[in-house]
């Protein structure tokens, strides 16, 4: 099952998956001036069997100068916070990465790919956070987030990480985001936490579509 939302945003931190669970999709995005080849894949998909996982489909970009008669499709980007910038894309896997069953490595780059990689994560995916350059980590627990399924809804656990500027003191004036607190203690998968944070409200709502109509006469 796809995770419906983005991993939590931590100020002055970026996240990275060290491995991608089977079922993860990566959009085939091309850099400016390029587009997917006609009838090319929209996405790469991490698939596998009990012994080996790999990325299905190949992303291919071609120059936009050669136009097709029908408009070329652009895959749907995620929101900015779910994107991974190029600096996060180097294969920084730990040594035991290859042996992690049911997971794919970071896919190799393709020619003229976009500067940001857009992933669609699945339940069970773990991402790791680190403070950006110039900030240091104050840990109050694991600096990671896991996409979990609870009561039929997906949600990401809150990483216990605060990134502070080098010049700042370690004294905090109680500005911690309220959404961090539910994750501060162990929780049972059967208990339902209802909080008023945007994230919880988002995940408790069922996705719906409503269609309506307006008509206009041509003058």
């Amino acid at each position: 099952e796809l995770c419906d939302d983005d991993p939590p945003e931590i100020p002055h931190a970026t996240f990275k998956a060290m491995a991608y669970k089977e079922g993860t999709m990566l959009n085939c995005e091309c850099k400016r001036g390029f587009r997917r080849i006609k009838s090319g894949s929209l996405y790469m998909l991490c698939t596998g069997n009990s012994s080996h996982s790999s990325w299905d489909n190949q992303c291919q970009c071609t120059s936009s100068a050669t136009r097709n008669t029908t408009k070329q499709v652009t895959p749907q980007p995620e929101e900015q916070k779910e994107r991974k910038t190029t600096e996060m894309q180097s294969p920084m896997q730990p040594v035991d990465q290859a042996s992690l069953p049911g997971h794919c490595r970071e896919p190799p780059p393709w020619e003229n790919e976009a500067t940001e990689r857009i992933y669609h994560f699945v339940v069970g995916q773990m991402v790791y956070y680190q403070c950006v350059q110039g900030y240091r980590a104050l840990h109050r627990g694991p600096a990671e987030s896991v996409c979990k399924m609870t009561h039929g809804k997906t949600r990401w656990t809150q990483p216990q990480l605060i990134c502070t500027g080098e010049m700042e003191t370690s004294q905090f004036p109680g500005e911690e985001k309220p959404q961090a607190s539910p994750e501060g203690r162990p929780e049972s998968e059967t208990s339902c936490l209802v909080t008023t944070t945007d994230f919880q409200i988002q995940t408790e709502m069922a996705a719906t579509m409503e269609t309506s109509i307006f008509t206009t006469e041509y003058q």
């Epitope: 894949s41 929209l42 698939t47 749907q76 779910e82 709502m205 719906t208 579509m209």
Partner: antibody
Framework: PGASVKVSCKAS????????MNWVRQAPGQGLEWMGG????????TYAQGSTGRFVFSSDTSVSTAYLQISSLKPEDTAVYYC???????????WGQGTTVTVSS | WTQSPDTLSVSPGDGATLSCRAS??????VAWYQQRPGQAPRLLIY???TRAAGVPARFSGSGSGTEFTLTISSLQSDDFAVYYC?????????FGQGTKAEIK
């Protein structure tokens, strides 16, 4: 015939800009036909081969709504028009209830 | 992208098998939908064999490459509907023409 119609599709319960929105139509007694979709993040539309010209897809992220505009309506445009959230390999998992457009003189 | 049969006459409680054939290999990139009269389609299966959330276990999908099957193990009264397959490999998305499951 000749008029214009704008069908709206309001999404709720998820981040609107995370997924593309498809438009699918179904003529009376017929099957499902993919008309195309819109990248809700960039507003970039894509049209199926038979949907170019009189059909325009647009979206407004501030109200989490996608739109389908049909101009110069013809009797053969009579159909139920559905919007559906596009999750690629994972299919169209959430559908609107459909809007019936009837073109008659 | 061919779906068969066009119509399937089944007695309640019996099983049913619906087929879809792609003209070229699309691995497991197939979704199945159910559409009851007067309603919007509903996603049943994605990735050829994974049931969508809330779909009863009597629905199962199988296949890979060019041949795909939707199996309903024991038809209940509200399973009598039209079923569509769709390739989810790349745009343009394409649907099968539909299979109507009717009461025998």
């Amino acid at each position: 015939p000749g008029a214009s119609v704008k069908v709206s599709c309001k999404a709720s319960g998820y981040t609107f800009t995370t997924y593309a929105m498809n438009w699918v139509r179904q003529a009376p007694g017929q099957g499902l036909e993919w008309m195309g979709g819109i990248n809700t993040n960039t507003g970039d539309p894509t049209y199926a081969q038979g949907s170019t010209g009189r059909f325009v897809f647009s979206s407004d992220t501030s109200v989490s709504t996608a739109y389908l505009q049909i101009s110069s309506l013809k009797p053969e445009d009579t159909a139920v028009y559905y919007c559906a959230r596009d999750r690629f390999h994972y299919g169209m998992d959430v559908w609107g209830q459909g809007t019936t457009v009837t073109v008659s003189s | 992208w061919t779906q068969s049969p066009d119509t399937l006459s089944v007695s309640p409680g019996d099983g049913a098998t619906l087929s879809c054939r792609a003209s070229e290999g699309i691995r497991t990139s197939v979704a199945w939908y159910q559409q009851r009269p007067g309603q919007a389609p509903r996603l049943l299966i994605y990735g050829a064999s994974t049931r969508a959330a809330g779909v009863p276990a009597r629905f199962s999908g199988s296949g890979s490459g060019t041949e795909f099957t939707l199996t309903i193990s024991s038809l209940q009264s509200d399973d009598f509907a039209v079923y569509y397959c769709q390739q989810t490999h790349t745009w343009p998305w394409t649907f099968g023409q539909g299979t109507k499951a009717e009461i025998k």
